[in-house]
């Protein structure tokens, strides 16, 4: 490589300057325009509308001189709506009369089709606790829960666990503060990512895997309403409810003793397929070693705030970084795959599809995934979720950005860290990190309350810019958080994952685990191997820092040893000990299942809050297994084997 | 074919009230929204009023709220325009204009009707 | 209130190409649509979302928007285009027109 020499070198300064300077004169709001205009739009996964957008971002990516660009097919199978309407009736017990309330004009996809009738209990946000609070049993009665807090798929589980016989949805005036009360919206209740009739493994056509089904799948029906439905419904139930859920006014709690409420649903399943575009910049030192820049395409409504700003700012994002490469020199070490991604709308089926594919060799190649949708949902605060490996590219980028409107710099606390919210199931985020173990990141500009039209017929361009009339501004800035996140994790010879964070994470777990030493003393267990785990982490976190700064910055071969043991970290958080198929989302951390330490804290108190319900002999193999995964993230950040002490 | 066909425009003093109508046809009348655009004599259009497709929302320009109420029956396919306390600056063509689908949220008056003349005078 | 600027009058000659701008505050921002009306008719809409020709609209006719902004371009003039043109934007729930232009052909 004799032309090394004639590229002047580039630092930090010199590309956080260009990437700004090229965002200024980017025009944001005209490609999310364009993103909703009539031939694009609505653009349901697998439509002609979604596959019109396919071709165009493909083009995009082509016209942008990409090292390469593709696509992966996948044939999943979805649930849509029938042509026999879904529907919600009031009964009377005796069936002496009936009063359609709705056929609503929305749907959850992947509802289990029945029809079911009995009283109506509402139960809040359909958490956990909420139902715990109910004083109301809700076993063989259906339930209505209002939209937002945590996903549709999670309320179902819920109630589903509560022995409800079905689930109804809407959005209230207090929380959802839209106009008109007849609008109709969408989700799905699959509590998992990807196709659920191959859980754990990838839809690609010439894949003949025996039939299968996700056991996050629902077995109760569930439907959204209107708010106008609810209302009606309202009207035929009693008692106020709690003034601590701070909702509408017409809130009631429970069907009048002569009432009943029947939902039939009726949804079918259908084969579709769906393109997922790539394209690639690689890079100049170690191409197979790249970053993943991803949106979500696909959109049950018009999508402007769901799927046209994230896959604004991934063109935009493609363009800005193949200038910078291709017309002013900038040499990224490590590869950028730029990717659009459909199905999202069904649970990131195609993200979550394509780590499906690559599941033995993805995580040892890319090393970060930044999710840019619903990038842009306000102004006022900027929040994010991610892994703790990426908390100080993170703090520094945040130290870096101005905010759009304020000026001031994005990092106004320094205990954001503390304040950081888990990734969940609805974000693209979620299987990246908690079921291929590839530390990612997702964020966005947004306000204190939801933005409330996601999801809903309503979220159209024109919405969003009169609810953001800076929208140009505030996508910039986001373009600008995800580009500096992209230079500085291609660009630096030493990997930007901070392993060390994960220290922190250990001894938070540890302190809270120890609250219950007595327990465990009791049970004649000793926490004693997990601290040497423990230690063994952060012994090696420090000898990884210590070989970091003994070892020459030019030596190439040196630091992609370094970089590939740092690159493995999130990897090991994978437990071992559970198949990817039952548990896809291993992550001991953010993962989901009994093999989780929040699992293992949750199961643990019930020794002394509901003891029949403890399973000491699960416990013990939970502690087991922790600790030795803890351990083997240990060894793995040690290096080599004969490096390793044995003493454990 | 869609069609719209208004009626009820003439003479009434200021102060008066008169009501308008636009019989529909040739499409689903309740799943779109429907407008009122006036024209007065030698000027350009001005936008008076909006309806939902359900009726349950509607809009109006400042210069007729509080006097103009805009109403439909989705059941006779036909809109209405109630006005009162006529002024002389209400003098125009009214026109009652579909408001199409637009994926964007920006919804183009996409068929119009041939107008009604309603004068204001003493 | 949000308002739209038209010029009063365009003329052209026929075959030569006409172009009418709409101005307003951000304009580009927002979808903007126009409208053709010819004497003793009532308007009819030629262009949506900024460019979109419906059914039946000769391909002469053509519009852009950005900026501040909107353009109405009927390329080929013909003595059937003389007419007065409105443009037309959303804002917020209620909806605002230019105040036309007069197309003469000459």
């Known amino acids: 490589k004799d032309d090394d020499d004639k590229v002047p070198q580039l630092y930090w300064d010199d590309l956080k300057k260009m990437l700004s300077e090229k965002l200024d004169t980017t025009d944001f709001t005209s490609t999310i325009k364009l993103l909703n205009e009539n031939s694009y739009v609505p653009r349901e996964a697998g439509s002609q509308k979604d596959e019109n957008l396919a071709w165009y971002i493909e083009n995009q990516f082509r016209e942008c001189k990409l090292s390469k660009v593709w696509r992966d097919e996948h044939f999943v199978k979805i649930q849509v709506k029938d042509s026999a309407q879904n529907s919600v009736t009031i009964t009377g017990t005796n069936s002496e009369f009936v009063y359609l309330v709705e056929n609503p004009g929305g749907y959850v996809a992947y509802s289990q089709n029945a029809t079911v009738t009995g009283k109506l209990v509402h139960a809040n946000f359909g958490t956990e606790k909420d139902f715990e609070d109910l004083d109301s049993p809700v076993n063989g009665s259906l339930v209505i829960v209002r939209a937002g807090k945590i996903t549709f798929a999670e309320k179902v589980a819920n109630a589903e666990s509560a022995n409800a016989i079905g689930v109804l949805i809407y959005m209230d005036k207090t929380k959802f503060p839209i106009v008109d009360a007849d609008v109709s919206f969408f989700g799905h209740a699959h509590l998992g990512t990807g196709d659920p009739y191959t859980p754990g493994f990838p839809s690609f056509n010439h894949t003949q895997f025996p039939p299968s089904r996700s056991s996050g799948l629902p077995n109760i029906p569930v439907q959204t309403i209107s708010r106008a439905a609810a209302e009606r419904l309202f009207e035929n139930m009693e008692g106020d409810c709690p003034s601590d859920w701070k909702t509408d006014s017409s809130c009631r709690m429970v069907t009048s003793q002569n009432k009943s409420v029947k939902l039939s649903v009726s949804n079918v399943m259908k084969e579709i397929k769906i393109l997922n575009i790539f394209g690639v910049i690689k890079g100049f030192v170690e191409p197979d070693r790249y970053v993943v820049v991803g949106a979500q395409r696909d959109s049950w409504g018009p999508g402007a705030a769901k799927s046209s700003v994230g896959t604004a700012l991934l063109l935009e994002l493609a363009q800005t970084f193949s200038d910078m490469v291709l017309k002013d020199g900038f040499q990224p070490s490590r590869s950028i795959v730029f990717a659009s991604w459909s199905a999202g709308d069904f649970g990131s089926v195609g993200a979550t599809e394509w780590l499906e594919g690559y599941l033995s060799s993805l995580h040892l190649k890319a090393f970060t995934f930044i999710n840019l949708d619903k990038a842009v949902l306000g102004t006022s605060n900027f929040r994010v979720s991610a892994s703790p490996l990426l908390y100080a590219l993170i703090e520094k980028t945040m130290q870096e950005v101005k905010h759009p409107v304020t000026g001031l710099s994005l990092y106004q606390d320094s205990n954001w860290a503390s304040k950081v919210e888990k990734l969940t199931f609805d974000n693209a985020a979620f299987p990246f990190l908690a079921y291929s173990g590839i530390p990612a990141v997702s964020f966005c500009f947004c306000e204190d309350t939801d933005y409330p039209y996601l999801g809903t017929t309503m979220d159209t361009y024109k919405e969003l810019i009169e609810k953001i009339p800076q929208l140009n501004k505030v996508a910039r800035a986001a373009a600008e958080v995800a580009g500096q996140f992209m230079i500085k994790l291609t660009h630096d010879v030493e990997l930007n994952l901070d392993y060390e964070r994960y220290n922190s994470q250990l001894l938070s777990f540890l302190r809270n685990l120890n609250q219950y030493r007595a327990d465990i003393r009791e049970m004649g267990l000793s926490l004693q191997w997990l601290y040497s785990a423990r230690g063994d982490f952060f012994r090696a976190t420090s000898r990884l820092t210590t070989d970091f700064k003994n070892s020459e910055k030019t030596d190439r071969f040196v630091m992609k040893e370094l970089n590939d043991r740092v690159m493995k970290v999130e990897y090991y958080f994978l437990s071992p000990y559970v198949s990817p198929r039952e548990s896809p989302f291993r992550h001991i951390f953010w993962g989901s299942g009994s093999h989780t330490l929040s699992a293992l804290l949750e199961h643990l108190k019930l020794r002394k809050t509901n003891n029949r319900a403890f399973n000491e002999t699960l416990f013990r193999n939970q502690l087991a297994l922790a600790t030795w995964t803890i351990q083997g993230a240990a060894n793995a950040l040690s290096g080599d084997i004969w490096d390793i002490d044995n003493e454990f | 074919e869609v069609q719209l066909l208004e009626s009820g425009g003439g003479l009434v003093q200021p102060g008066g009230s008169l009501r308008l109508s636009c019989a529909d046809s040739g499409f689903t009348f309740s799943s779109y929204a429907m407008n009122w655009v006036r024209q007065a004599p030698g000027k350009g259009l001005e936008w008076v009023s909006g309806i939902s497709g359900s009726g349950g929302h509607t809009y109006y320009a400042d210069s007729v709220k509080g006097r103009f109420t805009v109403s439909r029956d989705n059941s006779k396919n036909t809109l209405y325009l109630q006005m009162n306390s006529l002024r002389a600056e209400d003098t125009a063509v009214y026109y009652c204009?579909?408001?199409?689908?637009?994926?964007?949220?920006?919804?183009?008056?996409?068929?119009w009707g041939q107008g009604t003349q309603v004068t204001v005078s003493s | 209130s949000y308002e739209l600027t038209q010029p009063p009058s365009v003329s052209v000659s026929p075959g030569q190409t006409a172009s009418i701008t709409c101005s307003g505050d951000?304009?580009?921002?927002?979808?903007a649509c126009w409208y053709q009306q010819k004497p003793g008719q009532s308007p009819v809409l030629v262009i949506y979302q900024d460019s979109k020709r419906p059914s039946g609209i000769p391909e002469r006719f053509s519009g852009s928007n950005s900026g501040n902004t909107a353009t109405l371009t009927i390329s080929g003039t013909q003595a059937m285009d003389e007419a007065d043109y409105y443009c037309q934007a959303w804002d917020s729930s209620t909806v605002v027109f230019g105040g036309g232009t007069k197309l003469t052909v000459l």
């Open positions: 204009a579909r408001e199409g689908y637009d994926s964007s949220g920006y919804n183009p008056f996409d068929y």
């Open positions: 951000k304009l580009g921002d927002k979808y």
